[in-house]
């Protein structure tokens, strides 16, 4: 028991020896730095661990394992010490006691003592086997986390080597971003010279749009004037025409009945010669008042009375309804001849509506009635059509029987809401009914879902605007 | 009487489309245009769009343009909205309802009894 | 769009008190409005159009009134079938839009 060595092995192992008598007994335990703590017992089949445990409770362990072998050794030790004493007794109690008793006394002793050290023996061999275990279970801990080390050292390489090719690429990517950089600023750069020279032309261009509308401005004032010529022109003529037919009229009374000082529509005009379409002035049959009406001598054989025209929206037609009795507009553009005098031309004789339309897409359509007519004003001009043909529709897209004319400020219509309020401009409205060409003029692309729009249901349906519209006239049998 | 009756709940997966018919009797199928109106559960009602049966004519609102479809059946009578490309605040009832006029698209006076379309992954 | 904004968002009146919802344009939308009628688990139901003009078979304690912008839908005498949520609905101009509702309860 006496001799207890600590020491290290060439494999770097305590080692652990202790000499009992004869015998002698050597522990090799492993350095450790990591062992698993006693609340979590080893499992042979466990999912090894990417990342070794603390150190510190293995190291706890293997203190508390020296302390109980020293421990143990100290034990023994006084083991050792007692025996000794005992002996020592026991022999002076042997010289002192007859020499009979001493082969009894001996065997006794010898007996105790055996029976002692079997005992220190046992325990002792107990221990052995519970540090072997330990021992065990920390190599086998140890292999483990030799294994863990080595692949995170593998996972920290591979990551190193995965830094070093992201840090080349970002490396080639910020080479790659100043180079665009610089060509962005070229870019920019030339933009800027471009951009510059449009606002230069732009400048350009707008006094020379400037100098065109002053051009057209003087060029319109000069229309007006040679319009106004033309006039006086015609008048001349007609006036000499009529001095000639006077004169004339024993010799040749043909030119008399050919030549007319006014004409009641654009089919008179036709008839007298003038077949280019331009505006002309014309005048119904006992009476002095004058319209200006556009004339179309090219569809459909010529002679059309243009009663309504819709082509850009420059002209609004919420209107009042003397604004729709009399007229309003540009005859050269958009539009509308004037109720009474259409009301009083189509009660003369037998008239035909022409209505043409064209979408924004191209397309072109018509509606052609065989008779129309408008009533007086007293009857608030209510409108009568009678057979239909054409492209736009094999339903009238003006309601029949006809209704009256209804516009912002006189409310005929058959709806509890005042339609030309609603749907704006006038029309001979129902309640509110399939179609309205006096309706707002909306533009390509703004034309569908919407309510106040140039409707004509029987060709569009309800939410289109049209792009264009022309109302015209003709005697019925031209 | 005039009665307009639609086609069941429907649960949809994001992403996808629903079909909703509504079958219209009691009058001339394509007299009256046809509207389609959605109400999100604490929402305001909606207007997605209408049809005019008689020639097919179509008018959507902007917010579902290129998202909902309306066509017709006349010769059964029905009105059908596809709602595509769903996403969770698509969870509503659709009403599909008759307007009072042909030729414009006024109030609504006959209403179907509302699909529950739930969109949902 | 044409913003319709109703007011109260809910209503609270004795049975055969009066009750009276407001809406309010964002813009002119004429007398086009309509007024409807929804109770739970129910379709909306028509009620007054062209702002004053009570559908077939509405009863005649339901009223509106208004043009331009301000429009009312009143209940002369409330009843318990009354018990509702009210709508108002313009039809000026695309797209029709609608009120986010006025609920009506019995105090």
């Known amino acids: 028991y006496n001799n207890f060595r600590k020491s290290m092995d060439s494999i770097g192992k305590k080692q652990y020896q202790v000499q009992h008598g004869s015998c002698s007994y050597t522990f090799l335990l492993p350095e450790m730095d990591n062992c698993r703590s006693s609340s979590s017992p080893y499992v042979s089949n466990a999912v090894q661990r990417d990342a070794p445990l603390e150190y510190d409770d293995s190291v706890q362990r293997l203190q508390v394992l020296e302390n109980i072998m020293e421990n143990n050794t100290q034990w023994l030790m006084k083991l050792e010490n007692y025996i000794q004493d005992n002996m020592k007794k026991e022999m002076v109690e042997i010289q002192q006691n007859a020499v009979q008793n001493q082969t009894a006394v001996m065997i006794e002793i010898g007996t105790n003592l055996l029976n002692q050290t079997a005992e220190q023996t046992r325990k002792l061999t107990d221990v052995e086997a519970q540090v072997l275990n330990q021992t065990t279970r920390l190599e086998l801990q140890l292999l483990e986390h030799s294994l863990s080390t080595n692949k995170l050292e593998k996972q920290i390489l591979d990551q190193t080597s995965e830094i070093n090719k992201l840090q080349d690429k970002n490396s080639f990517l910020e080479k790659k971003v100043l180079a665009m950089e610089d060509k962005h600023i070229i870019q920019l750069q030339s933009i800027k010279e471009e951009k510059d020279q449009l606002q230069v032309l732009v400048s350009k261009q707008n006094s020379i749009i400037e100098e065109l509308e002053k051009k057209i401005v003087t060029a319109t004032v000069n229309n007006s004037v040679l319009q106004k010529q033309q006039h006086d022109l015609m008048e001349t003529v007609n006036n000499l025409l009529t001095m000639m037919s006077t004169s004339n009229s024993a010799k040749d009374p043909t030119v008399a009945k050919g030549e007319q000082i006014s004409f009641r529509d654009c089919a008179e005009v036709f008839k007298s010669g003038h077949t280019t379409n331009g505006v002309y002035t014309l005048t119904l049959p006992n009476s002095t008042e004058e319209v200006k009406a556009y004339c179309d001598m090219e569809a459909g054989g010529g002679g059309w009375t243009i009663i309504q025209r819709r082509e850009d929206g420059s002209v609004d037609f919420q209107r009042t309804w003397k604004e729709y009795k009399v007229g309003f507009g540009n005859p050269s553009g958009e539009y509308w001849l004037g109720n009474e005098f259409v009301s009083q031309l189509t009660n003369q004789q037998r008239y035909v509506l022409k209505i043409h339309l064209k979408d924004w897409e191209g397309n072109e359509a018509y509606s052609l009635y065989e008779h129309f007519y408008l009533s007086s004003e007293e009857l608030n001009y209510r409108i009568h059509l009678k057979g239909l043909t054409g492209t736009a529709g094999k339903i009238s897209s003006i309601s029949q029987p006809g209704n009256d004319f209804s516009t912002k400020d006189a409310d005929n219509d058959k709806c509890i809401c005042k339609c030309s309020q609603m749907l704006t401009g006038g029309w001979w409205f129902d309640a509110c009914g399939p179609s309205n060409l006096n309706g707002m003029y909306y533009p390509q692309r703004q034309n569908t879902n919407k309510f106040n729009g140039i409707k004509w249901y029987y060709w569009k349906g309800s939410g289109y605007s049209l792009k264009g519209t022309t109302m015209m006239i003709r005697p019925a049998g031209f | 009487q005039v009665q307009l009756v639609q086609s069941g709940a429907e649960v949809k997966k994001p992403g996808s489309s629903v079909k909703v018919s509504c079958k219209a009797s009691?009058?001339?199928?394509?007299?009256?245009?046809m509207v389609w109106v959605r109400q999100a559960p604490g929402q305001c009602l909606e207007w997605m769009g209408y049809i005019d049966p008689y020639n097919g004519g179509t008018g959507y609102n902007q917010k579902f343009e290129g998202r909902v479809t309306i066509t017709a059946d006349e010769s059964t009578s029905t009105a059908y909205m596809e709602l595509s490309s769903l996403r969770s605040e698509d969870t509503a009832v659709y009403y599909c309802a008759r307007t009072r006029d042909r030729y414009d698209v006024w109030y609504f006076d006959v209403w179907g009894q509302g699909t529950l379309v739930t969109v949902s992954s | 769009d044409i913003v319709m904004t109703q007011s109260p968002d809910s209503l609270a009146v004795s049975l055969g008190e009066r009750a009276t919802i407001n809406c309010k344009a964002s813009q002119d939308v004429y007398i086009a409005v309509a007024w409807y009628q929804q109770k739970p688990g129910q379709p909306p139901k028509l009620l007054i159009y062209?702002?004053?003009t009570r559908d077939t078979g509405v009863p005649d304690r339901f009223s509106g009134s208004g043009s331009g912008t301000d429009f009312t839908l009143t209940i002369s005498s409330l009843q318990a079938e009354d018990v509702a949520v009210y709508y108002c609905h313009q039809y000026s101009s695309y797209p029709p839009t609608f009120g986010c509702g006025t609920k009506v309860e019995i105090k």
């Open positions: 009691g009058y001339s199928f394509t007299d009256y245009n």
């Open positions: 062209w702002a004053s």
